[in-house]
C-alpha cells in the first residue's frame, strides 16, 4: 500500500541533492585554502539533520545551528555585497572583483544556491515530489529558514560601507518583502556600518532616469536613516560597461558615467 504523502505547492527537492551538496562542499574547500579543514561529510550530515524527519513547515533557526557551526567563515566585513532580485550580475561582479563577497561566495551560501530541499515528518526520506511554498504553504520551511538564518548572519557580519545591488527594471526596486528588505536591512549593525550604498542597475539601454529618486529607494533611505546608518545611491546605467570597467579600470571609456 503506497504511503500517503503531503502534496505541497512548491517544487520538490532538487534531484541528486545529497550528491550536489557534498560535491559543492568538496569543490569549495579545494578552492578556498582557509576552509580546507572542513569535513564535508560532517557538513552534509549536519545539513541533512536540519530537515530530515522534521515537518517541513516547522523548521527553526536552531535546526541549522550544527550546520552553521561547521560553516563558520570569516568574511572581510567591509567587502560585503548584498543584492536583491539581481543575483547573476552580483555574482558576475564578485567573480571579477575578487575581494568582495556575496553570501553565495561563502561556503554555506555556495552549498545551497539555487537548490530546493525538504523532508517529511517521522521518515528519513527526502521529498523529491514537492516542498512547501513560502506564500502558499508556510514560511517556516527548510529553504526559507536556511536563507533567513545565513542572511541574518551575513548582514550582522558587515561593517564600514556595505553595498547592495538592486534591480532597476522591477516595479519595486526596493522590496520590503525580499530577503534584503525583510532580513538584511534590519540586521545591519549601526555601530559597525557607517553607510549603505545602493547600486541601482538599469535594464534599458536608453534609460537615463535617475532611479535613485524612485519612491521605493526613498523608502529604503528612510528605513536606513532611522537606523542611524548613512545612505547613498548610484545609478548603474550600463551594467555591461560597469562590469567591463571593473575588469579593466584603466580603459579610457571608464572615466565617464556608467
Amino acid at each position: 500500500v503506497p504511503r500517503w504523502r503531503q502534496q505541497w505547492s512548491g517544487p520538490g527537492t532538487t534531484k541528486r541533492f545529497p550528491e550536489t551538496v557534498l560535491a559543492r562542499c568538496v569543490k569549495y574547500t579545494e578552492i578556498h585554502p582557509e576552509m580546507r579543514h572542513v569535513d564535508c561529510q560532517s557538513v552534509w550530515d549536519a545539513f541533512k539533520g536540519a530537515f530530515i524527519s522534521k515537518h517541513p513547515c516547522n523548521i527553526t533557526e536552531e535546526d541549522y545551528q550544527p550546520l552553521m557551526k561547521l560553516g563558520t567563515q570569516t568574511v572581510p566585513c567591509n567587502k560585503i555585497l548584498l543584492w536583491s532580485r539581481i543575483k547573476d550580475l552580483a555574482h558576475q561582479f564578485t567573480q571579477v572583483q575578487r575581494d568582495m563577497f556575496t553570501l553565495e561566495d561563502t561556503l554555506l551560501g555556495y552549498l545551497a544556491d539555487d537548490l530546493t530541499w525538504c523532508g517529511e515528518f517521522n521518515t528519513s526520506k527526502i521529498n523529491y515530489q514537492s516542498c512547501p511554498d513560502w506564500r502558499k504553504d508556510c514560511s517556516n520551511n527548510p529553504v526559507s529558514v536556511f536563507w533567513k538564518t545565513v542572511s541574518r548572519r551575513f548582514a550582522e557580519a558587515a561593517c564600514d560601507v556595505v553595498h547592495v545591488m538592486l534591480n532597476g527594471s522591477r516595479s519595486k526596486i526596493f522590496d520590503k518583502n525580499s530577503t534584503f528588505g525583510s532580513v538584511e536591512v534590519h540586521n545591519l549593525q549601526p555601530e559597525k556600518v557607517q553607510t549603505l550604498e545602493a547600486w541601482v542597475i538599469h535594464g534599458g539601454r536608453e534609460d537615463s532616469r535617475d532611479l535613485c529618486q524612485d519612491p521605493t529607494i526613498k523608502e529604503l533611505e528612510s528605513i536606513i536613516s532611522k537606523r542611524n546608518i548613512q545612505f547613498s545611491c548610484k545609478n548603474i546605467y550600463r551594467p555591461d560597461k560597469f562590469l567591463q570597467c571593473v575588469k579593466n579600470p584603466e580603459d579610457s571609456s571608464c572615466t565617464s558615467e556608467i
Epitope: Q65, K69, T72, T74, V75, I80, R153, C159, K192
Partner: nanobody
Framework: QLQLQESGPGLVKPSETLALTCNVS??????????WGWIRQPPGKRLEWIGS???????DYNPSLKSRVTISVDTSKNQFSLKLTSVTAADTAVYYC????????????????RGQGTLVTVSS
C-alpha cells in the same frame, strides 16, 4: 549568559604600551562557540575595530593598527588581553572587549556581546 569585563590602567604615557585584560564569565573562552575581539571609541568619533582572535588561535588586526597590536588568550584565567604599543594622544578612547558567536559567516568585528568599556587616556 556571557559577560565581559575590561580592566587595566586608565592613564598611559605617550610612547608607552597600553595593556588591557578582558575577563569572561558565563562561558569558556576556549569554547569553539565564540571568538573575541577589541574595539574602541575615541571621544566624539565612531567605534573602531582593533582586532580579533579566533578559536584556532589565529588573529586579525585592523590594518591601520596592525604594527602596534597584539591580542592573546589566557585559557587558565578565562580571559583575553590587548597590547597596543607606542601610544599617542590619538589612542585616547573608551576600549571595549567583545565576543561573537562563532557560526556561519562572521565579520572580523564580534558584536554579540560587549563589555561596559574602560576609558584610557594617553597623556604625560
Amino acid at each position: 549568559q556571557l559577560q565581559l569585563q575590561e580592566s587595566g590602567p586608565g592613564l598611559v604615557k605617550p610612547s608607552e604600551t597600553l595593556a588591557l585584560t578582558c575577563n569572561v564569565s558565563g562561558g569558556s573562552i576556549s569554547s569553539s562557540s565564540y571568538y573575541w575581539g577589541w574595539i574602541r571609541q575615541p571621544p566624539g568619533k565612531r567605534l573602531e575595530w582593533i582586532g580579533s582572535i579566533y578559536y584556532s588561535g589565529s588573529t586579525d588586526y585592523n590594518p591601520s593598527l596592525k604594527s602596534r597590536v597584539t591580542i592573546s588568550v589566557d585559557t587558565s584565567k578565562n580571559q583575553f588581553s590587548l597590547k597596543l604599543t607606542s601610544v599617542t594622544a590619538a589612542d585616547t578612547a573608551v576600549y571595549y572587549c567583545a565576543g561573537g558567536y562563532n557560526y556561519g559567516p562572521v565579520g572580523q568585528w564580534p558584536s554579540d556581546y560587549r563589555g561596559q568599556g574602560t576609558l584610557v587616556t594617553v597623556s604625560s
